[in-house]
Interface confidence: low
């Protein structure tokens, strides 16, 4: 399916609006520090060029690859060297090395100011004055902060963003209408970004076999009535889509995602009874809906797996003939029967089954050797079940904030070398698993909890890779994708860690603490908690609780005082002295 001009092909397939949006996202994800106006200029130049190619596919340069065209355009940025340093060296390379070089310089934690939300009236005026610029700015700001955001999904978020302003800027109470919608988009956006980051890490660090295994398990849970051949086709197509998006090929990715949505809607009968309501929606909404669709009902009469995968005398013959297909079948059959298992658990079971066959099919009596393979699954299943049970009990007992604090202490003791902001961010997100998953029925708890934890721990791995400080973190992050969470769970107090020297400055607070939002206050207190544990890693829960209670009382007292700053200046050193004594 070759085209004389790739850029013309994608422009025609996607249409001008989506083409421009995707090019803006691509450029913003590569050059994260460039000003908005610079990116808009580059996008307009690329769009004008694409239109000349649509008019005449034989025109000069229209036959060039998208990487060549986009890379050439990025390399025209005058301030590349001073803004990005060694990333400018990418421009000396030829494709495909140049694009690989740009990808390697994507920054998961760019030094960008947090987005401040203006007053509602200010936002509505900006929306009405220039809707197109307003929406482009949204794409730009999100894309540069989230360089692996799933681009076609970001277009869907932008469409929802636009709809929120169109509706709420005409409402009687604009703020009451708009702010909850913006909060929802922000939270969903962060979650979407983190989920996509795990997909890209899976592809880039562990290869497409790892991603395909994940996709077989997840799609088999979602579509348990679909045939293996159907699931395999969807997995192949989905892998192509995500490989493209993670590789910066956003136009191809969006185009292929649209094709996949079309295929699924044309073949609903052989995939799932749940697709119907998605397929009536417009493209962006349809693709989102298909990605989030609930699991179909399991067929009622599925026979036992043991017959084909344990009792059959042909297991080793079948395994030897087509290892990946046979294991794929096993994973498909197991996953469709277990929507109550996390995908990561299903992948561990497939890995255990593979290891048993590798060992047993070389044994004198293979059948005797693998006869008890399903019994070996029991401890693998019980471990996440117990973990979810214990942590949900703790969450219900403590509430979200204190549950986060318990995790902060737990993870700081495990990996105290990790930076305090990273420990706070990751532990706060780990703590959100409670509100997200513990209220669900038993059968949905494990898939919700463990697969969410995998996403959060991937964030830790991604941040740690940028600035490696802990061998334990490196080990858990790189040895096995499916065993990351059990690896972190198994970490104990780091006995080799030399406690951090006490720094009074870290525990000095000012009156500005009183004007912070509740969330910002929590982050301040949790930052102090991490620093306390780094100073006294062997402090007991009771000691830490005492210090934190004193801290809360001290802040509350000073925020009620007439002269707040004077109170902080006087009471702060007392709090520090009392804390040191309590932890001695």
């Amino acid at each position: 399916d070759t085209h004389k001009s790739e850029v013309a092909h994608r422009f025609k397939d996607l249409g001008e609006e989506h083409f421009k949006g995707l090019v803006l996202v691509a450029f913003s994800q590569y050059l994260q520090q460039c000003p908005f106006e610079e990116h808009v200029k580059l996008v307009n130049e690329v769009t004008e060029f694409a239109k000349t190619c649509v008019a005449d596919e034989s025109a000069e340069n229209c036959d060039k690859s998208l990487h060549t065209l986009f890379g050439d355009k990025l390399c025209t940025v005058a301030t590349l060297r001073e803004t990005y340093g060694e990333m400018a060296d990418c421009c000396a390379k030829q494709e495909p090395e140049r694009n690989e070089c740009f990808l390697q310089h994507k920054d998961d934690n760019p030094n960008l100011p947090p987005l401040v939300r203006p007053e509602v009236d200010v936002m509505c005026t900006a929306f009405h004055d220039n809707e197109a610029t307003f929406l482009k700015k949204y794409l730009y700001e999100v894309a540069r902060r989230h360089p692996y955001f799933y681009a076609p999904e970001l277009l869907f978020f932008a469409a929802r963003y636009k709809a929120a302003f169109a509706e709420c800027c005409q409402a009687a109470d604009k703020a009451a209408c708009l702010l909850p919608k913006l909060d929802e988009l922000r939270d969903e956006g962060k979650a979407s970004s983190a989920k996509q980051r795990l997909k890209c890490a899976s592809l880039q660090k562990f290869g497409d076999r790892a991603f395909k295994a994940w996709a077989v398990a997840r799609l088999s849970q979602k579509f348990p009535k679909a045939e293996f051949a159907e699931v395999s086709k969807l997995v192949t197509d989905l892998t192509k889509v995500h490989t493209e998006c993670c590789h910066g090929d956003l136009l191809e990715c969006a185009d292929d995602r649209a094709d996949l949505a079309k295929y699924m809607c044309e073949n609903q009968d052989s995939i799932s009874s749940k697709l119907k309501e998605c397929c009536d929606k417009p493209l962006l909404e349809k693709s989102h809906c298909l990605a989030e669709v609930e699991n179909d009902e399991m067929p009622a009469d599925l026979p036992s797996l043991a017959a084909d995968y344990v009792e059959s005398k042909d297991v080793c013959k079948n395994y030897a003939e087509a290892k990946d297909v046979f294991l794929g079948m096993f994973l498909y059959e197991y996953a469709r029967r277990h929507p109550d298992y996390s995908v990561m658990l299903l992948l561990r079971l497939a890995k255990a089954y593979e290891a048993t066959l590798e060992k047993c099919c070389a044994a004198a009596d293979p059948h005797e050797c693998y006869a008890k393979v399903f019994d070996e699954f029991q401890p693998l299943v019980e471990e996440p079940q117990n973990l979810v049970k214990q942590n949900c009990e703790l969450f219900e007992q403590l509430g979200e904030y204190k549950f986060q604090n318990a995790l902060l202490v737990r993870y700081t003791k495990k990996v105290p070398q990790v930076s305090t902001p990273t420990l706070v961010e990751v532990s706060r997100n780990l703590g959100k698993v409670g509100a997200k998953c513990c209220k669900l029925p038993e059968a949905k708890r494990m898939p919700c909890a463990e697969d969410y934890l995998s996403v959060v721990l991937n964030r830790l791995c991604v941040l740690h890779e940028k600035t490696p400080v802990s061998e334990k973190v490196t080990k858990c992050c790189t040895e096995s994708l499916v065993n990351r969470r059990p690896c972190f769970s198994a970490l104990e107090l780091d006995e080799a860690y030399v406690p951090k020297a006490f720094n009074a400055e870290t525990f000095t607070f000012h009156a500005d603490m009183c004007t912070l939002s509740e969330k910002e206050k929590q982050v301040k207190k949790q930052t102090a908690l991490v620093e306390l544990v780094k100073h006294k890693p062997k402090a007991t829960k009771e000691q830490l609780k005492g210090v934190m209670d004193n801290f809360a009382a001290f802040v509350e007292k000073c925020c009620k005082a007439d002269d707040k700053e004077a109170c902080f200046a006087e009471e702060g050193p007392k709090f520090v002295a009392a804390s040191q004594a309590a932890l001695a």
């Epitope: 009535k225 045939e227 067929p299 084909d308 009792e311 059959s312 079948m329 059959e333």
Partner: nanobody, 115 residues
Framework: EVQLVESGGGLVQAGGSLRLSCAAS????????MSWVRQVPGKGPEWVSA????????RYAESIKGRFIISRDNAKKTLYLQMNSLKPEDTAVYYC????????GSQGTQVTVSS
């Protein structure tokens, strides 16, 4: 591309017999268990019978036990269903699937049993 093509269906009197065939291509037929599934219009698919990859282990739904026999010829990449003592309630579209799926991945073959 995986393809499964069923044949052998038709109209038969109650008590009569039919032999269905399913020709497979596009995958290693001998490496997979196979199933027969049937569907009556307006109803969900019903699993009928399964056979392991080597043809040694066979399983049947209660409703057809003792009347139907599943078999396979791996050299010919073909799955069979010998249907004896047919009853009007066996009327359905029959199709074969890889593994133990009850999803319709092919066109199927119509079996009609008249009383």
């Amino acid at each position: 591309e995986v393809q499964l093509v069923e044949s052998g269906g038709g109209l038969v009197q109650a008590g009569g017999s039919l032999r269905l065939s399913c020709a497979a291509s596009g995958f290693t037929f001998g490496s997979f268990g196979m199933s027969w599934v049937r569907q009556v219009p307006g109803k969900g698919p019903e699993w009928v019978s399964a056979i392991d990859s080597g043809g040694t282990d066979t399983r049947y739904a209660e409703s057809i036990k003792g009347r139907f026999i599943i078999s396979r010829d791996n050299a010919k990449k073909t799955l069979y269903l010998q249907m004896n003592s047919l009853k009007p309630e066996d009327t359905a579209v029959y199709y074969c699937t890889i593994g133990q799926s009850t999803s319709r991945g092919s066109q199927g073959t119509q079996v009609t049993v008249s009383s």
